[in-house]
Structure formats: C-alpha cells, structure tokens
C-alpha cells in the first residue's frame, strides 16, 4: 500500500537489527507508514537499557522515522538469587546468565535439604525457571530429627544427655521462671501454652537459648521471640486441655549438629505411640534430688494406657480431666518422669521408617510427686494439632 503524499519524503529503508526482523517489509515507506520490530525467541527489545514489549516506528513528514531502531539483545536473567544455607553453581559457564544458561542450586549438606532437583534454566521471559516451571529459587529447608541418641537410657530417673542427643532442646528463661521447648523449624519453637502464657503479651522478655547441654553454659545460641501463639482452646488456670503454643523467632537460627529441629509426626506416626511404645523426654527440670538439673537429662519412658491414666487422675485430682488431646507416659512402678522445669519440652519417638525423631508429646502436667508409682506424666498429644501448627506457620 502506498500513500502518495507529494509534500513528504520517503523514509530510509529500515534494516532489521541482528536477531530481529521487520514487518511489514515494503519497497518504500512514506508518511504515516509504519514498521514493527520482532526479536527471535531468547532475545528482547531494548532501547539502550530500557525494555520494550513492542516497537513500532512511524514515518514522518520530513522523511525520518519517529524513533531510532532498537536492539534485539539476548535475554539476560541476571545473577541468580542467593540461596540461604546453600549455594549456586554455574553449569553453562562461569557467570553465564543469558538465555538457555543453566545453574544448579544445592543446599549445605547434612543439615539442609531441598524438595526439587535445584536445576534452573534462563528462559525467554527473563526468569530463572525450574523444570517444574517455578520462577522462585528453591528453599533450603532444615533437616529434622537427626540425633546421636539411641534408646536405652534410664530428669527423674534420668541420665545426662550427650552432645547431639537432643539438638532441638530449647531453654526458655523468664525473669524468675524456666521452661523448655522444641525447635520445629529454623524459626519456630513448640512449647506448652502454660509455660509461656504470662509472656504472651511481652514476648521479647523471654530469653531463648539453644545448642547447650549445661543449663548455665555461657556458650549458647541466643534467639529472641517475635511473637507467641497460644492455642485458642487453652484456658489458663482451668485445666491443661490444648496446652500447646508456638513461638516465632525474630531470626532464623543456623542448623548444625547441636541445633536442629525435631520432626513433626507423620499421619502414620500414631501407630508408633501406642501403649507401651517408648518415647524419650529431656529437660533441665527437677531431678530425684529435687534440684534443677545442671546438665540436660533425659529419660526413656513408655506410653501408658489412656484409660488407666484417666482413672488414676480422676481419683487423685477429681475435676482434673485427662482429655483425648493428651497422652500419658511413665511406669506403673514409678521412677521415670518429667518434672517441674521440664514443661514445654518434647516427648520424642523414633520413626523406624525414616530413622528420624519426631515430637509426639509436649511436657504438660502431672502429679505433684514426679515419678511416683501409678502417677503418670501427662503430655499434649501433638498429632492432634498438626493442622493448627501448619496453619500458624504458613500464615505468620
């Protein structure tokens, strides 16, 4: 199509930029004629460093185009995002970040893991993209439940823990109180609601220490709480139903051999917490001598029959209810138990299939006489709260 404008001059023939093409191609371009530039896949339109989605030039009356020719520049995805607790390797070549370049993310071995294979390609849209089409970099999730502990130990009736036995064990210190918790992610601590209830509005006054065996060790890793989440079904001073809380930490802690989360129970874990199955609980609470333990102590204790436990406490403390949200543990003969100062700590079990330790219970309440015969320790049954835990963690 030719417009015959005698007063106007034709525009110079446009030459397509390298890796680009022009449309429409005409023998002559006169006033108001236009052309567009299209780039090959993997190349983008740039005017200098300004990205353009499209380019159209119009021929003007004076015989010049209204804008200069852009470039078709190879897509550059830029340096990939850093991976906390991991690293990135350039597969195509050192620092090559252009179209079809390949990078490989990997996590620090032993203590972190990623769900994908970590391979990303620089795609035509300018984003590093995984084989599943994900544009965000992978996440190095902390490994959970690895321990050097083996069952067979005898808190009350307990014995001292060794380094790496309970790397999830957390010491919670108030001005005048002490309790425990269990690390369940690199920035979340699981504990008992009653242990942190008074601190719920003043979370920052709670001093959190981890990576220690000795209660008074100066070589601890300090963590500070950002927020405390008490289960909405917990009523302070009116029994211990829903005695569970989460503490969000201000910063993620670095996972290593002495600081590691405990796993949460899988759906199948209920079968590992039946009557007479053995769990392990650790703490710095009162020992047989009635003093707070200096060293982290642990005890292996069997799960007690729920009906027996309910009956014992109905007799012992009428009005105190052992609910379906609780599990009991201890020996009928007594001698092994958790005690004051252990509250909030984890009762853990070994998952034979994964060979990882998971938290089955949270030290909650029991008889005033820790370790007394026929008087079991009562623990919050964590498996009942997995949806609650997951909901809090995903929303906050």
């Amino acid at each position: 199509h030719h417009h015959h404008h005698h007063a106007s001059r034709p525009c110079p023939d446009p030459t397509a930029p390298p890796n680009g093409s022009i449309s429409p191609v005409q023998a002559i371009y006169v006033l108001k004629d236009r052309f567009s530039v299209f780039c090959k896949t993997g190349f983008e339109l740039l005017q200098g460093s300004v990205p353009l989605k499209s380019f159209t030039a119009v021929c003007q009356k004076d015989g010049s185009w209204d804008r200069p020719m852009p470039e078709c520049s190879i897509i550059d995805c830029g340096p990939p995002d850093d991976l906390p607790n991991g690293h990135v390797d350039y597969i195509t070549g050192p620092e090559v970040t252009t179209y079809k370049a390949v990078i490989q993310y990997s996590c620090e071995e032993t203590f972190y893991t990623m769900s994908s294979n970590g391979k990303y390609v620089c795609e035509a849209d300018g984003f590093w993209t995984s084989s599943k089409g994900e544009k965000l970099p992978p996440v190095c999730e902390p490994v959970c439940g690895l321990s050097t502990h083996t069952i067979g130990g005898r808190i009350v009736g307990g014995q001292p823990a060794k380094p790496g036995d309970f790397p999830w064990q957390v010491l919670l210190l108030g001005q005048t109180t002490a309790a425990a918790g269990a690390l369940i992610h690199d920035n979340w601590v699981l504990t008992a609601a009653h242990a942190v209830y008074e601190k719920r509005m003043a979370a920052s006054s709670l001093n959190i220490r981890m990576g220690i065996l000795k209660r008074l060790s100066p070589h601890y890793t300090q963590a500070w709480p950002e927020e405390i989440f008490i289960h909405e079904g917990y009523t302070h001073g009116a029994g211990f139903d829903n005695d569970i809380a989460l503490i969000k930490l201000k910063n993620k802690v670095t996972i290593n051999g002495s600081i590691m989360p405990v796993c949460l129970p899988r759906k199948e874990a209920a079968s590992l917490m039946r009557t007479d199955f053995t769990g392990t609980v650790a703490g710095w609470g009162l020992t047989q001598k009635g003093l707070l333990a200096r060293n982290l102590m642990f005890v292996d204790i069997p799960i007690a029959d729920h009906q027996k436990c309910t009956a014992v406490y109905e007799k012992l403390y009428p009005g105190v209810r052992v609910s379906a949200n609780m599990l009991c543990a201890g020996l009928e003969t007594g001698g092994k138990d958790s005690c004051r100062g252990d509250a909030g700590g984890a009762l853990v079990f070994l998952d034979n299939e994964t060979q990882r330790w998971f938290v089955g219970g949270i030290v909650s309440w029991g008889s005033i006489n820790c370790g007394a015969a026929d008087q079991y320790g009562v623990y919050t049954k964590v498996i009942n709260y997995i949806p609650w835990i997951e909901n809090i963690i995903s929303n906050f």
Epitope: Q47, G48, S49, V50, P51, L52, K53, S54, F55, R67, P68, D125, G126, F127
Partner: antibody, heavy 118, light 105 residues
C-alpha cells in the same frame, strides 16, 4: 491519560525500612515499558533507583542493590519500593515514573517527600 | 556511567539561544534524554534518543550528539524556559546529570 501517584509514610526512622506505593491509572503496568523509582535529594540531584518492567523483571542501581526491592501487584496496577536500613542520607523526594526511552511519553508522579529522622 | 553537566548555572536573556551540555564518562550511543524541571514540579521529558523531540515540546528545543557529548539547544529562549535541565543516559542502567539551572541575566 496515564497518571502515577506515590503514597507512603513521610517520616521513617533510621535503620528501618522505607516502603512506598505507586498507583498507576490509565495504563496497565503489564502492557509495556519500565516502571521506575527515582529520587531527588535536597539540592536537586536526581538518582535512578531501579525499575520493574512490564514482564515483572527488575533492574536496580548497583549502589542500592543490597537494600532495594521493587515489586508489583498487577491486580491493583500498583508497583512498590522497599528500601531497607535507611539512614538520614535517604531523605529525598521519591518519584515513580514510566520511562520508555522515547517509546510513548514519559510520565512522572508528583513525588512524595520522605524524611529519615529519629 | 557518570553524566557530567559542567555548568551548574547559565545566564540568558529572553530571545537568546543557549546550549546546555552533557558529557558521558563512556560511550552511550544516542541513548540520552533531556528533562526540564521547574520548582515544586516533577521533571518533564523534552528529548529522547539524543535528538528526538517528544510530541507537544516546542520546536525551539533541539537535542544533538552521540557517543559521549550531548547538547540541548534552546533557540529564542522564553521566560517559561527558565528552569533546571537534566540529561539522562539509559544505555547502561540509568544515570542523571547533575543539572544546569537556566536563569535570567
């Protein structure tokens, strides 16, 4: 007509984060171009901070790269600036602007003054 | 890339012809724009790609140059042209010049 409007707090404390929003009307930020944040210091020196392109890709001034993040919400036709660990040196008038290198007019917001002070 | 506007101020009279210059620290091709800013206002784009005038910009404003040396010329200066002028390179990232203020003699 294309219009850009900045919004956000006028006062930020040192070491905190500065967060600003640019609301665009009259043109979709996914249609084309680069959507920029530019600031002007007392004394009128202009500094380009970074942009988010129509495709969602970002480019940042190398001098700010460790502290800056530009994101967008395409459903609201807004783009955002977050500048971390601010100091008194970050006191300036902050503009959002559509810069196209001559492809379509350049449009600027009216600017929002931000003071960093304790 | 540093864009140097060596003259902070330039004095002129209405009807004069004035040239504002800008020097790039390295080759920026023709990827340069010029902006005008009046007190209390946002910058307004005048020129793109070194020499192309935005629509609506009076033809007394002319841009020229390529590589490292660029000039904005205002022929027949009007009182409304008294403002600060900035150059911008967009060849590699984006950098502004420090500005040149046009004032009456």
């Amino acid at each position: 007509d294309v219009q850009l409007q900045e919004s956000g707090p006028g006062l930020v404390k040192p070491s905190q984060s500065l967060s600003l929003t640019c609301t665009v009307t009259g043109y979709s930020i996914t249609s084309d171009y680069a959507w920029n944040w530019i600031r002007q210091f007392p004394g009128n020196k202009l500094e380009w901070m970074g942009y988010i392109s129509y495709s969602g890709r970002t480019s940042y001034n190398p001098s700010l790269k460790s502290r800056i993040s530009i994101t967008r919400d395409t459903s609201k036709n807004q783009f955002f600036l977050q500048l971390n660990s601010v100091t008194t040196e970050d006191t300036a008038t902050y503009y959002c602007a559509k810069l196209g290198g001559g492809h379509g007019m350049d449009y600027w917001g009216q600017g929002t003054s931000v003071t960093v002070s304790s | 890339i540093v864009m140097t506007q060596s003259q902070k101020f330039m004095s002129t009279s209405v009807g004069d012809r004035v040239s504002v210059t800008c020097k790039a620290s390295q080759n920026v091709d023709t990827n340069v724009a010029w902006y005008q800013q009046k007190p209390g206002q946002s910058p307004k784009a005048l020129i793109y790609s070194a020499s192309y005038r935005y629509s609506g910009v009076p033809d007394r404003f002319t841009g020229s140059g390529s590589g490292t040396d660029f000039t904005l010329t205002i022929s027949n200066v009007q009182s409304e042209d008294l403002a600060e002028y900035f150059c911008l390179q967009y060849n590699s990232y984006l950098t502004f010049g420090s500005g040149t203020k046009l004032e009456l003699k």
